[in-house]
């Protein structure tokens, strides 16, 4: 099948890195400068991805292959082959449309990217706050209220270290 | 194929005006947001401004608020920067860029930039 689909199409023995040249009877010619075909048998070489402003080149454009790009620091890539760049933000933080804002009292965001999300209600586990939220961080939830009656601790101890044919005392 | 490209940019005295443009092809330009942004020597690049669709949203980083208007003219496919008083921490790289397809529905990316154009402010 190959044989004739060869006899057939000239173009699909042209391999990767080159085209099938119209113009040229159908000889297959190296892809021109900045542009590339990844598969054999194609009739034009697609142009090679530009990695500008806040995008970099991660992998240089070659005859077989697209160049690949990330973000310039101060962004992080968003979409299939990081197709975007979105802007970082500090801390407790969070990206809006108009630009990086602090979170709202009540909220928290330990990185550098998303959004900016409730602190945990430590009380929907019967619960208490043992460290308090932050912009940048969520709340610690402790014990609940009444493990922290008068004599109760309010951490529980580690257990005491046993040494073989001992008894704790 | 799908390009912007800056102008504009040259050598001004402190508290002087510059107007940047932006020429956008390949895309239909109305339906984008459109986003200045800049690189100072030696610093990461910044948020400058940007504007919606219509023109009915604008934002600005706050050390330029009052001191510079971003517009677009939706006819003449062109995004404008003027920038007025201008300071020589102004000095940088000044780039247009495209918010992504879906851009501040579920996301805040760009995806299209131009190569840049360079303001200097300097006596």
């Known amino acids: 099948f190959e044989r004739t689909r060869s006899l057939q199409d000239p173009c699909s023995n042209c391999p990767a890195g080159t085209f099938c040249d119209n113009n040229r009877n159908q000889i297959c010619s190296p892809c021109p400068p900045n542009s590339f075909s990844s598969a054999g048998g194609q009739r034009t070489c697609d142009i090679c991805r530009q990695c500008k402003g806040v995008f970099r080149t991660r992998k240089e454009c070659s005859s077989t292959s697209n160049a690949e790009c990330d973000c310039t620091p101060g962004f992080h890539c968003l979409g299939a082959g990081c197709s975007m760049c979105e802007q970082d933000c500090k801390q407790g933080q969070e990206l809006t449309k108009k630009g990086c804002k602090d979170c709202c009292f009540g909220t928290f965001n330990d990185q550098k990217r998303g959004i900016c999300r409730p602190w945990t209600n430590c009380s929907l586990d019967g619960k208490s706050v043992l460290v308090n939220g932050t912009k940048e961080r969520d709340v610690v939830c402790g014990p609940s209220p009444a493990d922290l009656s008068p004599g109760a601790s309010s951490v529980t101890p580690p257990a005491p270290a046993r040494e073989p044919g001992h008894s704790p005392q | 194929e799908v390009q912007l490209v800056e102008s504009g940019g040259g050598l001004v005295q402190p508290g002087g005006s510059l107007r940047l443009s932006c020429g956008a092809s390949?895309?239909?330009?109305?339906?984008?947001?459109m986003f200045w942004f800049r690189q100072a020597p030696g610093k990461e690049l910044e948020w400058v401004a940007n504007v919606n669709q219509d023109g009915s949203e604008k934002y600005y980083v706050d050390s330029v608020e009052g001191r510079f208007t971003i517009s677009r003219d939706d006819a003449k496919n062109s995004l404008y920067l003027q920038m007025n008083s201008l300071r020589a921490e102004d000095t940088a790289i000044y780039y247009c860029?495209?918010?992504?397809?879906?851009?501040?529905?579920?996301?805040?990316?760009?995806?299209?930039w131009g190569q840049g154009t360079t303001v200097t402010v300097s006596s």
């Open positions: 860029a495209r918010g992504g397809e879906g851009y501040s529905d579920s996301h805040y990316g760009t995806d299209v």
């Open positions: 390949g895309f239909t330009f109305s339906n984008y947001w």
